[in-house]
């Protein structure tokens, strides 16, 4: 808190300009009118105010707007946004994408702060869903944004927004998140032809079920090993050797290097060694010839 002191003669601010950087904290408090500050917020970011000076300016705005700042002020906060607490931001009603962009710009190049997370949450909740323009904006500033959402939050993403997602936006998504995103992507890209469809759907395949992988194996897609290794283990296990061979195409040779890692390891254990041998890769660990495979999960379901 800055003590209330009278403004020295001749120092009353008539406008927000660079001369204010030479004001002490108490002079800013005494000589800058809060209403003037609010109407000239767009000038604040053009002036190199220090951490302490920004504290005083924030204090003045807080007194003027105890219920929360209007959007006309929020849009021009600039570096003053860094002084806001999540509690301050929860009082705001941010509806304009331009306001969101302006505030995200302030923190650009730095990791997502609690303020930014709260701002995004308020904005998305206010819109009711994560529309394409918002998603475009958020992933441009924070490529990992999508993967920071819970499966429940992701369920509000409309399929049309999936067009805004780039492969790198999904890098940190876990299988539960991809389970939610994959059906949306499938719907979004359903009218594309085979090769174009595969290019778009590839990043989402960590959420694909077995039947979709079987269908892809019939389309000469030549899936790379990096994508294959991100597939759900339970979706890969029922695939036959022939299906995996068709799915990977020339990349099938990469299985040898991954034979000790999931899902390749678990898939090998489910295949007949005879079938694995047809690949000519020296994959070992399949079911020996003459052994009968009992599907115990099926047996339990029947009993």
């Amino acid at each position: 808190e800055v003590e209330k002191t009278a403004c020295p003669s001749g120092k009353k601010a008539r406008e927000i300009d660079e001369s204010l950087i030479f004001y002490k904290k108490w002079e800013l408090e005494a000589c800058v009118d809060a209403a003037l500050l609010a109407t000239q917020m767009d000038r604040v970011n053009a002036i190199p105010f220090t951490y302490e000076q920004l504290d005083v300016l924030k204090h003045k705005l807080d007194e003027l707007y105890p219920q929360g700042y209007p959007e006309s002020v929020i849009q021009h906060l600039g570096y003053l946004f860094l002084k806001m607490s999540p509690e301050d931001i929860r009082k705001w009603n941010v509806t304009s994408l331009e306001t969101l962009k302006a505030l995200l710009e302030v923190n650009k190049g730095h990791e997502m702060s609690p303020q930014v997370a709260t701002l995004i949450d308020r904005f998305v909740k206010g819109r009711g869903q994560l529309d394409k323009d918002t998603l475009d904006t958020l992933t441009a500033f924070y490529p990992g944004y999508l993967c920071s959402l819970s499966p429940e939050e992701l369920s509000s993403v409309p399929p049309s927004s999936i067009w805004a997602v780039r492969p790198q936006d999904l890098d940190t998504c876990d299988p539960r998140q991809l389970d939610v995103l994959y059906p949306k992507a499938r719907l979004a890209f359903q009218n594309m032809n085979g090769s174009e469809y595969f290019v778009k759907i590839q990043s989402f395949l960590g959420g694909a079920p077995t039947e979709d992988l079987k269908a892809l194996s019939q389309q000469n897609v030549s899936m790379d090993l990096a994508t294959f290794m991100k597939l759900r283990t339970d979706a890969v296990l029922p695939l036959t050797v022939a299906e995996v061979q068709k799915l990977l195409g020339p990349h099938v040779e990469g299985l040898k290097a991954e034979e000790r890692h999931r899902p390749v390891r678990d898939w090998i254990l489910r295949q007949r060694q005879d079938d694995l041998d047809t690949l000519g890769l020296g994959l070992q660990g399949g079911i020996p010839n003459g052994y009968l495979v009992l599907d115990l999960s099926m047996q339990e379901a029947l009993s």
Partner: nanobody, 114 residues
Framework: VQLVESGGGLVQPGGSLRLSCAAS????????VAWYRQAPGEQREPVAA???????IYADSVKGRFTISRDNAKNTVYLQMNSLKPGDTAVYYC??????????WGQGTSVTVS
């Protein structure tokens, strides 16, 4: 954000120095910047500033002697100091934008006029 100030040293009264401040990223090309100084036992005070629009302002004590400038291509800010006085002895810092708002500072560069 990293801020690296350089160019300080020991100089006789009436002499000149040119301080440089380099920043990581494109911080100085887009933000308002300023030079500050802190004399022993004193608080840090602003000496010269440049708005994001390019206009400059100086503390009364250095007006006519110091000049702030920037090279956006090199992402560097300069402080040309002429007619130096013993009262200019201090550690000089530059800052602006995100790091200034977050109170992150460089090591500074020491200027001694004696």
């Amino acid at each position: 954000v990293q801020l690296v100030e350089s160019g300080g040293g020991l100089v006789q009264p009436g002499g000149s120095l040119r301080l440089s401040c380099a920043a990581s990223g494109s911080m100085f090309s887009i933000n308002a910047v300023a030079w500050y100084r802190q004399a022993p036992g004193e608080q840090r005070e602003p000496v010269a500033a440049m708005t994001s629009g390019g206009s400059t302002i100086y503390a009364d004590s250095v007006k006519g002697r110091f000049t702030i400038s920037r090279d956006n291509a090199k992402n560097t800010v300069y402080l040309q100091m002429n007619s130096l006085k013993p009262g200019d002895t201090a550690v000089y810092y530059c800052n602006g934008g995100w790091s200034l708002a977050m109170d992150y500072w460089g090591q500074g560069t020491s200027v001694t006029v004696s």
